[in-house]
């Protein structure tokens, strides 16, 4: 068995974020069994979890993980120092902020310590695997009789993010959504004062600093409308 998915030269968006190589073997044995794929996500560039499906192994196996950065000053092979476990079997590795280099090619190697020839290596572009924390501190301002402005904060460099706002009224069956750039504000020009509105936001590390496909979790919703506070109609922020 010799599986190689090579990344062609060119654009990130036309290639996989990894390629996988499996050590060739001379005879069919346990070492021909493919190792599970490693999936890594960088959470708000605070830590990274690289995980694999430990239950895909034919028998419980404490697979080991090594990593390094290709063609860089950080190309020394590192052992995982903080394993994640599933039912007492290794199922992942957590790397801390100081070990994360977003703009260098991350190489991760999974190995069966009982069968050292059984190993798989993947290359990952970490800037495409960043997931920010959900937006926080949603606030609504009434700009005029019929116009609302929604603002929020991110625990992140704003220029690196894009956002998706969803809103609906109690009369709606589905959400209306609007893409928003790094400026983290959204205006709704026409608000019906007889309806109650719900807004929520999520964010993504895209496009200036990376090409992440995964969105953050949704923010806590915020509400505005017929049964909200009468005391200060010009500034209102209410958690669900």
């Amino acid at each position: 068995l010799n599986t190689t998915i090579l990344t062609p030269n060119g654009n990130e968006d036309t290639t996989a974020d990894f390629f996988l190589t499996t050590m060739p073997t001379d005879s069919l044995s346990v070492s021909t069994l493919p190792l599970p794929e490693v999936q890594c996500f960088v959470f708000n560039v605070e830590y990274m979890n690289c995980t694999w499906n430990s239950s895909s192994e034919p028998q419980p196996t404490n697979l080991t993980l090594h990593y390094w950065y290709k063609n860089s000053d950080n190309d020394k092979v590192q052992k995982c120092s903080h394993y994640l476990f599933s039912e007492e079997i290794t199922s992942g590795c957590q790397l801390q902020k100081k070990e994360i280099h977003l703009y260098q090619t991350f190489v991760v190697q999974l190995q069966d310590p009982r069968e050292p020839r059984r190993q798989a290596t993947q290359m990952l572009k970490l800037q495409n695997l960043v997931i920010p924390w959900a937006p926080e501190n949603l606030t609504l301002h009434k700009l005029s009789e019929s116009q609302l402005e929604l603002n929020w904060n991110n625990r992140f460099l704003n220029h690196c993010l894009e956002h998706l706002v969803q809103y609906r009224t109690d009369w709606d069956h589905s959400w209306t959504e609007q893409s928003v750039d790094y400026r983290h504000k959204f205006s709704l020009p026409s608000v019906d004062g007889q309806k109650r509105y719900t807004f929520r936001v999520r964010s993504r590390f895209n496009p200036l600093c990376g090409s992440a496909q995964h969105w953050s979790e949704w923010s806590h919703p915020i509400h505005w409308g017929s049964n909200t506070s009468k005391e200060n109609p010009f500034l209102f922020a209410l958690e669900a």
Epitope: H101, Q104, L157, H159
Partner: nanobody, 117 residues
């Protein structure tokens, strides 16, 4: 504070070429990601291209195959070679830089590119 200064913009006919430069006030080897974005009047900003310190580049679909981004760490300069220009490429082009820590986002004053038909 990092200063980035763009140059090379101007008026060009459709099908023509321009080369934009972005000079940095510090060693760009310390800037892990550099790129170009553009903004046309009344439009949201749009990523054009970006390149890591290791030379790994990315292009938006609208410019892929026509534009080439490169960086010269010895000259502390980022470049954008623009070929086969189209009227819809008309915009102010900004260069930007981001350290790996994401502690800051640096960008320049911009240079205007006008493509006439």
């Amino acid at each position: 504070q990092v200063q980035l200064q763009e140059s090379g913009g101007g008026l060009v006919q459709a099908g023509g070429s321009l080369r934009l430069s972005c000079a940095a006030s510090i060693s760009i080897s310390k800037i892990d990601l550099m790129g170009w974005y553009r903004q046309a009047p009344g439009r949201q900003r749009e990523l054009v291209a970006r390149v890591t310190n290791g030379g790994d580049s990315y292009y938006s679909t609208s410019v892929k195959g026509r534009f080439t981004i490169s960086r010269d760490n010895a000259k502390n300069t980022l470049y954008l070679q623009m070929n086969s220009l189209k009227p819809e490429d008309t915009a102010v082009y900004y260069c930007y830089g981001v350290p790996e820590s994401l502690a800051a986002f640096h960008w320049g004053q911009g240079t205007l590119v006008t493509v006439s038909s």
